[in-house]
Interface confidence: low
Amino acid sequence: APRGTQAEESPFVGNPGNITGARGLTGTLRCQLQVQGEPPEVHWLRDGQILELADSTQTQVPLGEDEQDDWIVVSQLRIASLQLSDAGQYQCLVFLGHQNFVSQPGYVGLEGLPYFLEEPEDRTVAANTPFNLSCQAQGPPEPVDLLWLQDAVPLATAPGHGPQRNLHVPGLNKTSSFSCEAHNAKGVTTSRTATITVLPQQPRNLHLVSRQPTELEVAWTPGLSGIYPLTHCTLQAMLSDNEVGIQAGEPDPPEEPLTLQASVPPHQLRLGSLHPHTPYHIRVACTSSQGPSSWTHWLPVETPEGVPLGPPENISATRNGSQAFVHWQEPPAPLQGTLLGYRLAYQGQDTPEVLMDIGLRQEVTLELQGDGSVSNLTVCVAAYTAAGDGPWSLPVPLEAWRPGQAQPVHQLVKETSAPAFSWPWW
């Protein structure tokens, strides 16, 4: 009777062979069967599991002229680039009638030079700072022994005698290369060469040396940089995340830090043209020929208050008998802090000066002594912050008020205002 018609008789007339080879090898497994009637689809198993995405081809050859005659079916499984995951027991599987038929097994094995699962990676490290490198390789054949090399010099007397998967490096003072060799019975494989670039250590002790309303002087201690001298340090400064820009009547501050380069030594830098009474954040990194260190943490710093840069303006002083009415407007120049109030001074030709603290009001009525007999009376006004008094206005003479006349206004010559604080600041 033709093959495949009886449940107990296997239709397979050719079973898969064996393949043993190194990684990357291309090979083919074949099985052949003879069946009566319509040819079945042949499936492949690896270690008993159906290979869903097998690269297989099936060839069918009729042995007679009738569809119900015998057919020869050949299935070929191509293994394109042998990997460890391809190793195992392979069989063909067909469904005939109501029964599964499985071929005799063939075996795929891997044997060759070691294969790297993990190789040392390029990285940057701070000078004199410990770090680890990793290397992992496998056969078969096992065992695989590793030998680490630094700048092409072995770090152990023989494979397997030194550190294996993880190499602990206590620190470097120059840029170095590392690789590892994997040894097994078939020979030696060398990993990629990792370049470990030695960067300067993060600067330490970033601190304020001095503070002025529009100026900060900062200093820091450089970290070790190995055999590579520092070429420069980079300082970044940014306005702290608050509403200073809005309070100063300017648009929101830009979000990117301003970046400045400092020649070294000295490890010190003066930041000028800052906003007074304003919080900033600063940080620093130092660079050698190998690259930059990591940044320090952002250091919060604050400029102190300053005195107003200009006097009050539009001062008007009018006299009516024993009373004088004085009013003014806020200085147009930057206040350099929080305005706490105004001081007013008035003086006659032959009388001592009278000094008054007006507070935050911008007008005052003065009670004059002696029914207005004091001659050549003049008034000066200054604004003040916690840092002190700003410049006094030019003296304004008191003018007699006559009914029906507008009160005289003395438009003082304005001082040149300081430049608007725009970004960048210096």
Epitope: Q236, P254, E256, P257, T259, W423, P424
Partner: antibody, heavy 117, light 107 residues
Framework: EVKLVESGGGLVQPGGSLKLSCATS????????MYWVRQTPEKRLEWVAY????????YYPDTVKGRFTMSRDNAKNTLYLQMSRLKSEDTAMYYC??????????WGQGTSVTVSS | DIVMTQSHKFMSTSVGDRVSITCKAS??????VAWYQQKPGQSPKLLIY???TRHTGVPDRFTGSGSGTDYTLTISSVQAEDLALYYC?????????FGSGTKLEIK
């Protein structure tokens, strides 16, 4: 308010040329490096060119070098990208972006360029 | 050029869930990583820079973390409006380069 508005995109035949513009407002244009970035139909973002704030330095990837030229007019607050010898793989949405010290913090709405015969 | 790899092309999540999108740099970029969000029909918008600093106006459910070569954008409680493409980008060395993007889908 920072605003970037691209224009000049359209349909062009392979080998043809196109000039994109990016009008900016709301910030001091001459203080910032600027970028052209394109987004392919597969949604991949690729930088196309950047230019320094003064316009003295430009940088291009190999894919466009010799074919694209980026320029700026700081007086007009405008950025340009002159594209020539266009290829089908240049088909993309082109964005101009402002480069701050840490990232591209503001982008335009984009202008579409299609290279097809 | 530095290569930025986003291994997940798509991520599916539900409203209220916590989700983390990862990005790997081909070399140490010393926390110089930005994250962008691109909603359908819009241009990319900056979310995070210097690995963990939120850009102005970005909700605090978005946080960034990471160092060396591995970086993560985390959304602590996903909202429906977070459906978008998310890109990482290194700003360590010009030319700045982007990851290929991760599409966040809401179940």
């Amino acid at each position: 308010e920072v605003k970037l508005v691209e224009s000049g995109g359209g349909l062009v035949q392979p080998g043809g040329s196109l000039k994109l513009s990016c009008a900016t407002s709301g910030f001091t244009f001459s203080d910032y490096y600027m970028y052209w970035v394109r987004q392919t139909p597969e949604k991949r973002l690729e930088w196309v060119a950047y230019i320094s704030n003064g316009g003295g330095s430009t940088y291009y990837p190999d894919t466009v070098k010799g074919r694209f030229t980026m320029s700026r007019d700081n007086a007009k607050n405008t950025l340009y990208l002159q594209m020539s010898r266009l290829k089908s793989e240049d088909t993309a949405m082109y964005y101009c972006a402002r480069l701050s010290f840490y990232a591209m913090d503001y982008w335009g709405q984009g202008t579409s360029v299609t290279v097809s015969s | 050029d530095i290569v930025m790899t986003q291994s997940h092309k798509f991520m599916s999540t539900s409203v209220g869930d916590r989700v983390s999108i990862t990005c790997k740099a081909s070399q140490d970029v010393t926390t110089a990583v930005a994250w962008y969000q691109q909603k359908p029909g819009q241009s990319p918008k900056l979310l995070i820079y210097w690995a963990s600093t939120r850009h102005t106006g970005v909700p605090d459910r978005f946080t960034g973390s990471g160092s060396g070569t591995d970086y993560t954008l985390t959304i602590s409680s996903v909202q429906a409006e977070d459906l978008a493409l998310y890109y990482c980008q290194q700003h360590y060395r010009i030319p700045f380069t982007f990851g290929s993007g991760t599409k966040l889908e809401i179940k």
